[in-house]
């Protein structure tokens, strides 16, 4: 039969993972680390190291393993049911609206403001003004105390784009 | 962020063969599963064929199996689908997409996924 796209076709069917592996879908679904077979009656594993899944699923294929970009440190490597995660380097961090890079944190604060934040994976050292305690808007300051930051250690996942 | 543009359709008799191109461009689209849908006129969208991100994985409706095959060139981030023996009605606007993956139904899966504008195939005597 051919297919049919509808609207809430479009909103990924996942539920939670029991611990068991199956062969064969339940429910039309297949377990983590599978995906569905062509004819629908099979759950084929996915490629160690290779692609993943990560929830009960009807997906045709499973997904791609992210690869760290160089200034990356990986963190786990991409198991059948887990993506890679990958962390900045020391003294680098990955911004919100920009996730694809990974940025060099400032080694200091602007004169006339104090550091009260450490350089993370995931954000700059955050400075505020020395008189009114407000935060610094996080441009590249013209003139720099040497005030060096040290590099937090928690994880943050990569981004499923790969 | 990805530009999809198909190419390659056209007017073809029965019987006839044509090859359509979906060419990627804006960021590479090695690591997302890739598809092609067609749209009938009066119809909806259909769910005709699809290839995993390493192009050893394929899915093909009933409709089309035997007859049309789906490749990819990842090095030219392009998407190709050969059309044989063709008949009336595969007549439709063929669209290439991508996406992390594809739901057996053919709803695209993950974050992001794109669409091109679409090619038209006739086929016709």
């Known amino acids: 039969e051919s297919a049919l796209i509808t609207q809430q076709d479009l909103a990924p069917q996942q539920r939670a993972a029991p611990q068991q592996k199956r062969s064969s879908p339940s429910e039309g679904l297949c377990p983590p680390g599978h995906h569905i077979s062509e004819d629908g009656r099979d759950c084929i594993s996915c490629k160690y190291g290779q692609d993943y899944s990560t929830h009960w699923n009807d997906l045709l294929f499973c997904l791609r393993c992210t690869r760290c970009d160089s200034g990356e440190v990986e963190l786990s490597p991409c198991t059948t049911t887990r993506n890679t995660v990958c962390q900045c380097e020391e003294g680098t961090f990955r911004e919100e609206d920009s996730p694809e890079m990974c940025r060099k944190c400032r080694t200091g604060c602007p004169r006339g403001m104090v550091k009260v934040g450490d350089c993370t994976p995931w954000s700059d050292i955050e400075c505020v003004h020395k008189e009114s305690g407000t935060k610094h808007s996080g441009e590249v300051p013209a003139v720099e105390e040497t005030v060096t930051s040290s590099p937090g250690t928690p994880a943050s996942p990569c981004s499923l784009s790969g | 962020e990805v530009q999809l543009l198909e190419s390659g359709g056209g007017l073809v008799q029965p019987g006839g063969s044509l090859r359509l191109s979906c060419a990627a461009s804006g960021r590479t689209v090695s690591n997302y599963a890739m598809s092609w849908f067609r749209q009938a006129p009066g119809k909806g969208l259909e769910f005709v064929s699809a290839?995993?991100?390493?192009?050893?994985?394929?899915y093909y409706a009933d409709s089309v199996k035997g007859r049309f095959t789906i490749s990819r060139d990842n090095s030219k981030n392009t998407l190709y689908l050969q059309m044989n023996s063709l008949r009336a009605e595969d007549t439709a606007v063929y669209y290439c997409?991508?996406?992390?993956?594809?739901?057996?139904?053919?709803?695209?899966?993950?974050?992001?996924?794109?669409w091109g504008q679409g090619t038209l195939v006739t086929v016709s005597s």
């Open positions: 290839l995993n991100w390493g192009g050893d994985t394929t």
């Open positions: 997409a991508a996406a992390q993956s594809f739901r057996r139904g053919g709803a695209p899966y993950g974050d992001n996924y794109w």
